[in-house]
Protein backbone atom coordinates (compact mmCIF):
# COMPACT_ATOMS: atom_id res chain seq x y z
CA UNK A 1 0.00 0.00 0.00
CA UNK A 2 0.91 3.67 -0.09
CA UNK A 3 2.59 5.04 3.06
CA UNK A 4 1.47 8.52 4.00
CA UNK A 5 3.31 10.67 6.58
CA UNK A 6 1.21 11.13 9.68
CA UNK A 7 -0.17 14.61 10.28
CA UNK A 8 1.21 15.90 13.62
CA UNK A 9 -2.16 17.56 14.33
CA UNK A 10 -4.03 14.24 14.51
CA UNK A 11 -6.08 13.39 17.62
CA UNK A 12 -4.44 10.86 19.95
CA UNK A 13 -5.32 7.26 19.32
CA UNK A 14 -5.98 5.48 22.61
CA UNK A 15 -5.88 2.00 21.16
CA UNK A 16 -3.12 1.20 18.69
CA UNK A 17 -4.24 -2.44 18.34
CA UNK A 18 -6.71 -3.81 15.85
CA UNK A 19 -9.73 -3.92 16.24
CA UNK A 20 -9.26 -0.19 16.58
CA UNK A 21 -11.72 2.49 17.51
CA UNK A 22 -11.57 5.71 15.55
CA UNK A 23 -13.34 9.05 15.75
CA UNK A 24 -15.81 9.75 12.94
CA UNK A 25 -17.54 13.06 12.24
CA UNK A 26 -21.09 12.24 11.12
CA UNK A 27 -21.57 15.57 9.39
CA UNK A 28 -21.67 14.06 5.93
CA UNK A 29 -19.71 15.67 3.16
CA UNK A 30 -21.39 15.03 -0.19
CA UNK A 31 -18.82 14.65 -2.95
CA UNK A 32 -21.37 13.85 -5.64
CA UNK A 33 -20.30 16.17 -8.40
CA UNK A 34 -22.74 14.49 -10.77
CA UNK A 35 -25.62 16.96 -10.98
CA UNK A 36 -27.60 14.99 -13.53
CA UNK A 37 -31.02 14.97 -11.82
CA UNK A 38 -32.18 11.85 -13.68
CA UNK A 39 -29.35 9.57 -12.57
CA UNK A 40 -30.80 6.07 -12.16
CA UNK A 41 -34.24 7.47 -11.29
CA UNK A 42 -36.33 5.96 -14.08
CA UNK A 43 -34.04 3.18 -15.26
CA UNK A 44 -35.87 0.67 -13.05
CA UNK A 45 -38.91 0.99 -15.32
CA UNK A 46 -37.19 1.46 -18.69
CA UNK A 47 -34.74 -1.41 -18.28
CA UNK A 48 -35.11 -4.67 -20.20
CA UNK A 49 -34.58 -6.21 -16.75
CA UNK A 50 -36.88 -3.93 -14.73
CA UNK A 51 -36.85 -3.89 -10.96
CA UNK A 52 -38.79 -2.59 -7.98
CA UNK A 53 -37.23 -0.81 -5.03
CA UNK A 54 -38.03 -1.97 -1.51
CA UNK A 55 -37.37 0.12 1.59
CA UNK A 56 -35.20 -1.64 4.16
CA UNK A 57 -35.32 0.20 7.49
CA UNK A 58 -33.21 -0.56 10.56
CA UNK A 59 -32.92 2.07 13.31
CA UNK A 60 -29.81 0.32 14.66
CA UNK A 61 -28.00 1.01 11.38
CA UNK A 62 -26.61 4.19 9.86
CA UNK A 63 -27.95 4.95 7.30
CA UNK A 64 -31.18 3.58 8.73
CA UNK A 65 -32.91 3.41 5.33
CA UNK A 66 -31.47 1.47 2.40
CA UNK A 67 -33.34 0.77 -0.84
CA UNK A 68 -33.10 -2.78 -2.17
CA UNK A 69 -33.80 -3.72 -5.79
CA UNK A 70 -35.79 -6.83 -6.69
CA UNK A 71 -35.92 -7.90 -10.34
CA UNK A 72 -39.53 -8.11 -11.54
CA UNK A 73 -39.08 -11.16 -13.74
CA UNK A 74 -36.68 -14.05 -14.24
CA UNK A 75 -36.58 -13.26 -17.96
CA UNK A 76 -36.00 -9.96 -19.78
CA UNK A 77 -38.40 -7.66 -21.63
CA UNK A 78 -38.16 -7.93 -25.41
CA UNK A 79 -38.94 -5.37 -28.11
CA UNK A 80 -42.65 -6.31 -28.04
CA UNK A 81 -42.87 -5.64 -24.29
CA UNK A 82 -43.17 -9.34 -23.44
CA UNK A 83 -40.93 -11.35 -21.13
CA UNK A 84 -38.31 -13.33 -23.05
CA UNK A 85 -37.22 -16.34 -21.02
CA UNK A 86 -34.24 -17.08 -23.27
CA UNK A 87 -32.51 -14.28 -21.35
CA UNK A 88 -32.17 -13.83 -17.58
CA UNK A 89 -32.72 -10.83 -15.34
CA UNK A 90 -30.12 -10.80 -12.57
CA UNK A 91 -29.50 -8.48 -9.63
CA UNK A 92 -26.40 -6.29 -9.62
CA UNK A 93 -25.11 -6.46 -6.08
CA UNK A 94 -22.59 -4.39 -4.18
CA UNK A 95 -20.96 -4.68 -0.80
CA UNK A 96 -21.33 -1.43 1.10
CA UNK A 97 -20.20 -0.15 4.48
CA UNK A 98 -22.73 0.89 7.09
CA UNK A 99 -22.45 1.75 10.76
CA UNK A 100 -24.13 -0.59 13.26
CA UNK A 101 -24.90 0.80 16.74
CA UNK A 102 -22.75 -1.13 19.19
CA UNK A 103 -23.62 -1.60 21.99
CA UNK A 104 -27.22 -1.61 20.67
CA UNK A 105 -29.30 1.58 21.02
CA UNK A 106 -26.21 3.75 21.61
CA UNK A 107 -26.34 7.10 19.81
CA UNK A 108 -22.57 7.65 19.61
CA UNK A 109 -20.89 4.26 19.38
CA UNK A 110 -20.79 2.19 16.20
CA UNK A 111 -19.08 -0.69 14.47
CA UNK A 112 -18.37 -0.82 10.75
CA UNK A 113 -20.41 -3.46 8.98
CA UNK A 114 -20.29 -4.79 5.43
CA UNK A 115 -23.62 -5.63 3.84
CA UNK A 116 -24.60 -6.84 0.40
CA UNK A 117 -27.24 -4.77 -1.35
CA UNK A 118 -28.95 -5.17 -4.68
CA UNK A 119 -28.78 -1.91 -6.64
CA UNK A 120 -30.63 -2.80 -9.83
CA UNK A 121 -30.92 -5.53 -12.43
CA UNK A 122 -29.26 -6.33 -15.72
CA UNK A 123 -30.13 -8.71 -18.53
CA UNK A 124 -27.66 -11.54 -19.17
CA UNK A 125 -27.30 -14.44 -21.56
CA UNK A 126 -27.98 -17.63 -19.58
CA UNK A 127 -25.24 -20.05 -18.70
CA UNK A 128 -25.95 -23.21 -20.66
CA UNK A 129 -25.29 -26.31 -18.56
CA UNK A 130 -24.33 -29.12 -20.94
CA UNK A 131 -25.31 -32.56 -19.71
CA UNK A 132 -22.61 -35.16 -20.41
CA UNK B 1 -38.81 7.83 13.03
CA UNK B 2 -38.55 5.00 15.53
CA UNK B 3 -37.45 6.00 19.03
CA UNK B 4 -35.26 3.47 20.77
CA UNK B 5 -34.46 3.63 24.48
CA UNK B 6 -30.81 4.47 25.09
CA UNK B 7 -28.62 1.68 26.42
CA UNK B 8 -27.24 2.79 29.83
CA UNK B 9 -23.93 1.05 28.99
CA UNK B 10 -23.16 3.42 26.11
CA UNK B 11 -19.84 5.34 26.06
CA UNK B 12 -20.11 9.01 27.00
CA UNK B 13 -20.70 11.39 24.15
CA UNK B 14 -18.47 14.46 24.46
CA UNK B 15 -20.34 16.48 21.89
CA UNK B 16 -24.14 16.31 21.94
CA UNK B 17 -24.49 18.78 19.06
CA UNK B 18 -24.58 17.95 15.40
CA UNK B 19 -22.14 17.67 13.60
CA UNK B 20 -21.27 15.03 16.17
CA UNK B 21 -18.22 12.88 16.55
CA UNK B 22 -18.83 9.23 17.30
CA UNK B 23 -16.66 6.25 18.11
CA UNK B 24 -16.46 3.62 15.38
CA UNK B 25 -14.92 0.16 15.69
CA UNK B 26 -13.19 -0.59 12.38
CA UNK B 27 -13.21 -4.35 12.94
CA UNK B 28 -15.67 -5.00 10.15
CA UNK B 29 -18.55 -7.38 10.75
CA UNK B 30 -19.62 -9.06 7.52
CA UNK B 31 -23.38 -9.63 7.48
CA UNK B 32 -23.55 -11.09 3.99
CA UNK B 33 -25.79 -14.07 4.60
CA UNK B 34 -26.23 -14.68 0.88
CA UNK B 35 -23.86 -17.55 0.18
CA UNK B 36 -24.48 -17.72 -3.58
CA UNK B 37 -20.83 -17.88 -4.74
CA UNK B 38 -21.58 -16.58 -8.23
CA UNK B 39 -23.11 -13.30 -7.15
CA UNK B 40 -22.42 -10.57 -9.74
CA UNK B 41 -19.00 -12.02 -10.64
CA UNK B 42 -19.50 -12.70 -14.34
CA UNK B 43 -22.51 -10.54 -15.09
CA UNK B 44 -20.31 -7.71 -16.41
CA UNK B 45 -19.40 -9.92 -19.40
CA UNK B 46 -22.68 -11.76 -19.94
CA UNK B 47 -24.88 -8.65 -19.78
CA UNK B 48 -26.53 -7.16 -22.85
CA UNK B 49 -25.12 -3.91 -21.44
CA UNK B 50 -21.61 -5.15 -20.55
CA UNK B 51 -19.23 -3.07 -18.45
CA UNK B 52 -15.61 -2.87 -17.41
CA UNK B 53 -14.47 -2.40 -13.82
CA UNK B 54 -11.96 0.33 -13.04
CA UNK B 55 -9.97 0.48 -9.81
CA UNK B 56 -10.31 3.76 -7.95
CA UNK B 57 -7.70 4.04 -5.20
CA UNK B 58 -7.47 6.81 -2.60
CA UNK B 59 -5.34 6.23 0.52
CA UNK B 60 -7.14 9.07 2.28
CA UNK B 61 -10.40 7.14 2.02
CA UNK B 62 -11.70 4.03 3.77
CA UNK B 63 -12.16 1.74 1.93
CA UNK B 64 -9.18 2.91 -0.09
CA UNK B 65 -10.09 0.83 -3.15
CA UNK B 66 -13.48 1.13 -4.90
CA UNK B 67 -14.32 -0.49 -8.22
CA UNK B 68 -16.20 1.70 -10.72
CA UNK B 69 -18.21 0.29 -13.60
CA UNK B 70 -18.02 1.88 -17.03
CA UNK B 71 -20.43 0.71 -19.74
CA UNK B 72 -18.57 -0.65 -22.76
CA UNK B 73 -21.03 0.62 -25.36
CA UNK B 74 -23.67 3.31 -25.80
CA UNK B 75 -26.02 0.70 -27.21
CA UNK B 76 -26.86 -2.84 -26.05
CA UNK B 77 -25.74 -6.22 -27.36
CA UNK B 78 -28.41 -7.95 -29.44
CA UNK B 79 -28.99 -11.67 -30.04
CA UNK B 80 -26.44 -11.67 -32.88
CA UNK B 81 -23.73 -10.26 -30.61
CA UNK B 82 -23.80 -6.86 -32.30
CA UNK B 83 -24.36 -3.47 -30.69
CA UNK B 84 -27.94 -2.28 -31.15
CA UNK B 85 -28.09 1.51 -30.93
CA UNK B 86 -31.88 1.52 -30.68
CA UNK B 87 -31.30 0.64 -27.01
CA UNK B 88 -29.05 2.34 -24.48
CA UNK B 89 -26.53 0.97 -21.99
CA UNK B 90 -26.68 3.08 -18.83
CA UNK B 91 -24.81 2.90 -15.51
CA UNK B 92 -26.69 1.93 -12.36
CA UNK B 93 -25.41 4.30 -9.73
CA UNK B 94 -25.58 4.18 -5.97
CA UNK B 95 -24.69 6.60 -3.23
CA UNK B 96 -22.43 4.94 -0.69
CA UNK B 97 -20.83 6.02 2.56
CA UNK B 98 -17.05 6.06 2.93
CA UNK B 99 -14.73 7.41 5.60
CA UNK B 100 -12.44 10.30 4.64
CA UNK B 101 -9.35 10.91 6.80
CA UNK B 102 -9.80 14.29 8.49
CA UNK B 103 -7.48 15.99 9.19
CA UNK B 104 -5.66 14.48 6.20
CA UNK B 105 -3.19 11.62 6.80
CA UNK B 106 -4.64 10.85 10.25
CA UNK B 107 -4.94 7.13 10.99
CA UNK B 108 -7.74 7.41 13.56
CA UNK B 109 -9.87 10.42 12.69
CA UNK B 110 -12.40 10.41 9.85
CA UNK B 111 -15.41 12.19 8.45
CA UNK B 112 -18.33 10.41 6.77
CA UNK B 113 -18.54 11.12 3.08
CA UNK B 114 -21.19 10.28 0.52
CA UNK B 115 -19.96 9.34 -2.94
CA UNK B 116 -21.74 8.20 -6.08
CA UNK B 117 -20.44 5.01 -7.65
CA UNK B 118 -21.44 3.09 -10.76
CA UNK B 119 -22.03 -0.53 -9.86
CA UNK B 120 -22.91 -2.00 -13.25
CA UNK B 121 -24.91 -1.27 -16.36
CA UNK B 122 -28.41 -2.05 -17.56
CA UNK B 123 -30.06 -1.85 -20.96
CA UNK B 124 -32.91 0.65 -21.26
CA UNK B 125 -35.34 1.78 -23.91
CA UNK B 126 -34.32 5.28 -24.99
CA UNK B 127 -36.39 8.32 -24.15
CA UNK B 128 -37.71 9.64 -27.45
CA UNK B 129 -37.74 13.43 -27.55
CA UNK B 130 -40.35 14.60 -30.05
CA UNK B 131 -39.44 17.81 -31.83
CA UNK B 132 -42.39 20.19 -32.13
Amino acid sequence: GITIPRNPGCPNSEDKNFPRTVMVNLNIHNRNTNTNPKRSSDYYNRSTSPWNLHRNEDPERYPSVIWEAKCRHLGCINADGNVDYHMNSVPIQQEILVLRREPPHCPNSFRLEKILVSVGCTCVTPIVHHVA
Amino acid sequence: GITIPRNPGCPNSEDKNFPRTVMVNLNIHNRNTNTNPKRSSDYYNRSTSPWNLHRNEDPERYPSVIWEAKCRHLGCINADGNVDYHMNSVPIQQEILVLRREPPHCPNSFRLEKILVSVGCTCVTPIVHHVA
Epitope: N52, H54, K70, C71, S89, I127 | -
Partner: antibody, heavy 124, light 113 residues
Framework: QVQLQESGPGLVKPSETLSLTCTVS????????VSWIRQPPGKGLEWIGI???????DYNSAFKSRVTISVDTSKNQFSLKLSSVTAADTAVYYC??????????????????WGQGTLVTVSS | DIVMTQSPLSLPVTPGEPASISCKSS????????????LAWYLQKPGQSPQLLIY???TRQSGVPDRFSGSGSGTDFTLKISRVEAEDVGVYYC?????????FGQGTKVEIK
Protein backbone atom coordinates in the same frame (compact mmCIF):
# COMPACT_ATOMS: atom_id res chain seq x y z
CA GLN C 1 -52.08 -10.88 12.22
CA VAL C 2 -52.13 -10.68 8.42
CA GLN C 3 -55.64 -10.24 7.02
CA LEU C 4 -57.06 -9.64 3.55
CA GLN C 5 -60.77 -9.10 2.96
CA GLU C 6 -62.46 -8.86 -0.43
CA SER C 7 -65.69 -6.91 -0.88
CA GLY C 8 -67.93 -5.85 -3.74
CA PRO C 9 -71.21 -6.63 -5.48
CA GLY C 10 -72.07 -10.29 -5.79
CA LEU C 11 -74.02 -9.78 -9.01
CA VAL C 12 -72.86 -7.97 -12.15
CA LYS C 13 -74.69 -7.67 -15.47
CA PRO C 14 -73.03 -8.85 -18.70
CA SER C 15 -70.99 -6.14 -20.50
CA GLU C 16 -70.66 -4.14 -17.26
CA THR C 17 -67.57 -3.68 -15.09
CA LEU C 18 -66.84 -5.87 -12.12
CA SER C 19 -65.32 -3.84 -9.24
CA LEU C 20 -63.85 -5.41 -6.12
CA THR C 21 -61.93 -4.04 -3.16
CA CYS C 22 -59.37 -5.82 -0.99
CA THR C 23 -58.77 -4.30 2.44
CA VAL C 24 -55.58 -5.46 4.12
CA SER C 25 -54.08 -5.24 7.59
CA UNK C 26 -51.21 -6.70 9.57
CA UNK C 27 -48.45 -6.08 7.03
CA UNK C 28 -46.51 -3.26 5.42
CA UNK C 29 -47.85 -2.14 2.05
CA UNK C 30 -44.49 -0.65 0.99
CA UNK C 31 -42.89 -4.11 1.18
CA UNK C 32 -45.48 -6.46 -0.23
CA UNK C 33 -47.15 -6.91 -3.58
CA VAL C 34 -50.72 -8.14 -3.93
CA SER C 35 -52.17 -10.47 -6.57
CA TRP C 36 -55.74 -11.17 -7.66
CA ILE C 37 -56.70 -14.77 -8.44
CA ARG C 38 -60.06 -16.20 -9.41
CA GLN C 39 -61.70 -19.62 -9.24
CA PRO C 40 -64.74 -20.41 -11.39
CA PRO C 41 -67.28 -22.70 -9.63
CA GLY C 42 -65.91 -26.24 -9.38
CA LYS C 43 -62.75 -25.32 -11.28
CA GLY C 44 -59.08 -24.47 -10.64
CA LEU C 45 -57.23 -21.24 -9.84
CA GLU C 46 -56.39 -18.56 -12.39
CA TRP C 47 -53.92 -15.71 -11.74
CA ILE C 48 -55.31 -12.36 -12.95
CA GLY C 49 -52.53 -9.94 -12.13
CA ILE C 50 -50.35 -8.24 -9.56
CA UNK C 51 -49.71 -4.77 -8.19
CA UNK C 52 -46.19 -4.23 -6.90
CA UNK C 53 -45.18 -2.18 -3.88
CA UNK C 54 -44.48 0.86 -6.10
CA UNK C 55 -47.91 0.79 -7.78
CA UNK C 56 -46.66 -0.86 -10.98
CA UNK C 57 -48.74 -3.70 -12.37
CA ASP C 58 -48.41 -6.88 -14.40
CA TYR C 59 -51.42 -8.66 -15.85
CA ASN C 60 -52.25 -12.05 -17.26
CA SER C 61 -52.40 -11.42 -21.02
CA ALA C 62 -55.75 -13.24 -21.12
CA PHE C 63 -57.25 -10.26 -19.23
CA LYS C 64 -54.85 -7.48 -20.23
CA SER C 65 -57.22 -5.40 -22.33
CA ARG C 66 -59.94 -5.27 -19.68
CA VAL C 67 -58.30 -5.49 -16.25
CA THR C 68 -57.04 -2.72 -13.96
CA ILE C 69 -55.51 -3.23 -10.52
CA SER C 70 -54.85 -0.20 -8.32
CA VAL C 71 -54.02 0.70 -4.73
CA ASP C 72 -55.07 3.37 -2.24
CA THR C 73 -52.33 3.21 0.39
CA SER C 74 -54.07 5.72 2.65
CA LYS C 75 -56.95 3.25 3.06
CA ASN C 76 -54.85 0.05 2.87
CA GLN C 77 -57.03 -1.00 -0.04
CA PHE C 78 -56.40 -2.65 -3.38
CA SER C 79 -58.95 -2.73 -6.13
CA LEU C 80 -59.69 -4.91 -9.13
CA LYS C 81 -61.74 -3.73 -12.12
CA LEU C 82 -62.68 -6.13 -14.91
CA SER C 83 -64.63 -4.60 -17.78
CA SER C 84 -66.97 -6.11 -20.38
CA VAL C 85 -67.78 -9.13 -18.25
CA THR C 86 -69.54 -12.23 -19.51
CA ALA C 87 -70.92 -15.33 -17.80
CA ALA C 88 -67.45 -16.88 -18.11
CA ASP C 89 -66.23 -14.34 -15.53
CA THR C 90 -68.46 -15.85 -12.84
CA ALA C 91 -66.04 -16.97 -10.13
CA VAL C 92 -64.82 -16.60 -6.57
CA TYR C 93 -62.30 -13.74 -6.64
CA TYR C 94 -59.40 -13.76 -4.18
CA CYS C 95 -56.81 -11.17 -3.30
CA UNK C 96 -53.58 -12.58 -1.93
CA UNK C 97 -50.33 -11.24 -0.55
CA UNK C 98 -47.18 -12.11 -2.45
CA UNK C 99 -44.46 -13.52 -0.25
CA UNK C 100 -41.63 -11.14 0.68
CA UNK C 101 -38.25 -12.73 1.31
CA UNK C 102 -35.32 -10.66 2.60
CA UNK C 103 -31.98 -11.33 0.89
CA UNK C 104 -33.81 -12.67 -2.16
CA UNK C 105 -33.44 -10.32 -5.08
CA UNK C 106 -36.49 -11.11 -7.20
CA UNK C 107 -40.14 -10.25 -6.82
CA UNK C 108 -41.98 -13.27 -5.52
CA UNK C 109 -45.07 -14.78 -7.12
CA UNK C 110 -45.91 -17.28 -4.39
CA UNK C 111 -48.92 -16.16 -2.33
CA UNK C 112 -48.51 -16.64 1.42
CA UNK C 113 -51.78 -15.09 2.68
CA TRP C 114 -55.20 -15.10 1.01
CA GLY C 115 -58.51 -13.38 1.55
CA GLN C 116 -61.58 -15.53 2.14
CA GLY C 117 -62.77 -14.85 -1.42
CA THR C 118 -65.96 -13.28 -2.76
CA LEU C 119 -68.33 -14.89 -5.27
CA VAL C 120 -69.23 -12.72 -8.24
CA THR C 121 -71.98 -13.93 -10.55
CA VAL C 122 -72.37 -12.43 -14.00
CA SER C 123 -75.99 -12.64 -15.03
CA SER C 124 -78.72 -10.42 -16.39
CA ASP D 1 -48.96 -20.30 -21.22
CA ILE D 2 -47.24 -22.95 -19.14
CA VAL D 3 -49.47 -25.96 -18.55
CA MET D 4 -49.29 -27.62 -15.13
CA THR D 5 -50.61 -31.18 -15.12
CA GLN D 6 -51.40 -32.90 -11.84
CA SER D 7 -52.05 -36.57 -11.19
CA PRO D 8 -54.06 -38.20 -9.87
CA LEU D 9 -57.05 -35.85 -9.96
CA SER D 10 -58.61 -37.75 -7.06
CA LEU D 11 -56.73 -39.51 -4.28
CA PRO D 12 -58.59 -41.57 -1.65
CA VAL D 13 -56.31 -42.00 1.38
CA THR D 14 -56.21 -43.91 4.63
CA PRO D 15 -55.24 -41.92 7.76
CA GLY D 16 -51.71 -42.81 8.87
CA GLU D 17 -50.74 -43.96 5.37
CA PRO D 18 -48.48 -42.02 2.97
CA ALA D 19 -49.78 -40.11 -0.05
CA SER D 20 -48.11 -38.69 -3.13
CA ILE D 21 -49.19 -36.18 -5.78
CA SER D 22 -47.39 -35.55 -9.06
CA CYS D 23 -47.14 -32.23 -10.93
CA LYS D 24 -45.61 -31.88 -14.39
CA SER D 25 -44.78 -28.59 -16.08
CA SER D 26 -44.79 -28.05 -19.85
CA UNK D 27 -41.44 -26.21 -19.49
CA UNK D 28 -38.55 -26.39 -17.04
CA UNK D 29 -39.02 -24.36 -13.87
CA UNK D 30 -35.31 -24.44 -12.98
CA UNK D 31 -33.69 -20.98 -13.08
CA UNK D 32 -30.05 -21.38 -14.10
CA UNK D 33 -28.82 -18.31 -12.21
CA UNK D 34 -29.72 -19.56 -8.73
CA UNK D 35 -30.58 -23.23 -9.31
CA UNK D 36 -34.03 -22.74 -7.76
CA UNK D 37 -37.15 -24.44 -9.11
CA UNK D 38 -40.08 -22.03 -9.14
CA LEU D 39 -42.80 -24.39 -8.00
CA ALA D 40 -45.17 -24.11 -5.03
CA TRP D 41 -47.88 -26.30 -3.48
CA TYR D 42 -51.12 -25.05 -1.94
CA LEU D 43 -53.89 -26.78 -0.03
CA GLN D 44 -57.47 -25.58 -0.27
CA LYS D 45 -59.48 -27.13 2.55
CA PRO D 46 -63.24 -27.46 2.05
CA GLY D 47 -64.94 -24.05 2.22
CA GLN D 48 -61.63 -22.21 2.70
CA SER D 49 -59.18 -20.22 0.62
CA PRO D 50 -55.88 -21.79 -0.50
CA GLN D 51 -52.93 -21.83 1.88
CA LEU D 52 -49.26 -22.02 0.89
CA LEU D 53 -47.60 -25.26 1.94
CA ILE D 54 -44.30 -25.39 0.06
CA TYR D 55 -42.37 -23.05 -2.24
CA UNK D 56 -39.18 -23.38 -4.31
CA UNK D 57 -40.09 -27.07 -4.66
CA UNK D 58 -39.08 -28.13 -1.16
CA THR D 59 -39.09 -25.19 1.29
CA ARG D 60 -41.89 -25.59 3.82
CA GLN D 61 -43.83 -22.47 4.68
CA SER D 62 -43.63 -21.63 8.39
CA GLY D 63 -46.23 -23.51 10.44
CA VAL D 64 -46.58 -26.32 7.91
CA PRO D 65 -46.13 -29.77 9.52
CA ASP D 66 -43.01 -31.70 8.54
CA ARG D 67 -45.10 -34.60 7.26
CA PHE D 68 -45.38 -32.50 4.07
CA SER D 69 -42.38 -32.59 1.77
CA GLY D 70 -41.70 -31.56 -1.80
CA SER D 71 -39.18 -32.79 -4.32
CA GLY D 72 -38.32 -32.69 -8.02
CA SER D 73 -36.57 -30.47 -10.54
CA GLY D 74 -37.05 -29.15 -14.04
CA THR D 75 -40.47 -30.36 -15.15
CA ASP D 76 -41.34 -33.18 -12.70
CA PHE D 77 -42.36 -32.48 -9.11
CA THR D 78 -43.89 -34.44 -6.25
CA LEU D 79 -45.67 -33.56 -3.03
CA LYS D 80 -45.55 -36.26 -0.36
CA ILE D 81 -47.49 -36.60 2.88
CA SER D 82 -45.66 -39.12 5.05
CA ARG D 83 -48.69 -39.96 7.24
CA VAL D 84 -52.02 -38.51 6.19
CA GLU D 85 -54.18 -36.97 8.90
CA ALA D 86 -57.91 -36.20 8.70
CA GLU D 87 -57.18 -32.45 8.54
CA ASP D 88 -55.17 -32.91 5.33
CA VAL D 89 -58.26 -33.41 3.17
CA GLY D 90 -58.93 -30.86 0.46
CA VAL D 91 -57.70 -29.92 -2.99
CA TYR D 92 -53.95 -29.63 -3.57
CA TYR D 93 -52.68 -27.29 -6.28
CA CYS D 94 -49.19 -26.88 -7.72
CA UNK D 95 -48.26 -23.45 -9.09
CA UNK D 96 -45.36 -22.28 -11.23
CA UNK D 97 -43.98 -18.78 -10.69
CA UNK D 98 -41.29 -18.79 -13.34
CA UNK D 99 -43.25 -17.73 -16.41
CA UNK D 100 -45.92 -15.07 -16.63
CA UNK D 101 -48.84 -15.69 -16.44
CA UNK D 102 -48.27 -17.71 -13.28
CA UNK D 103 -50.33 -20.84 -13.68
CA PHE D 104 -51.79 -23.53 -11.42
CA GLY D 105 -52.39 -27.23 -11.88
CA GLN D 106 -56.01 -28.40 -12.13
CA GLY D 107 -55.94 -29.70 -8.56
CA THR D 108 -55.86 -33.07 -6.80
CA LYS D 109 -58.73 -33.87 -4.45
CA VAL D 110 -57.54 -35.78 -1.39
CA GLU D 111 -60.29 -37.48 0.60
CA ILE D 112 -60.46 -40.07 3.33
CA LYS D 113 -61.41 -43.58 2.14
Amino acid sequence: QVQLQESGPGLVKPSETLSLTCTVSGFSLPSHSVSWIRQPPGKGLEWIGIIWNNGGTDYNSAFKSRVTISVDTSKNQFSLKLSSVTAADTAVYYCARNMYITDYYYENYFMDAWGQGTLVTVSS
Amino acid sequence: DIVMTQSPLSLPVTPGEPASISCKSSQSLLFSENQKNYLAWYLQKPGQSPQLLIYWTSTRQSGVPDRFSGSGSGTDFTLKISRVEAEDVGVYYCQQSYYTPYTFGQGTKVEIK
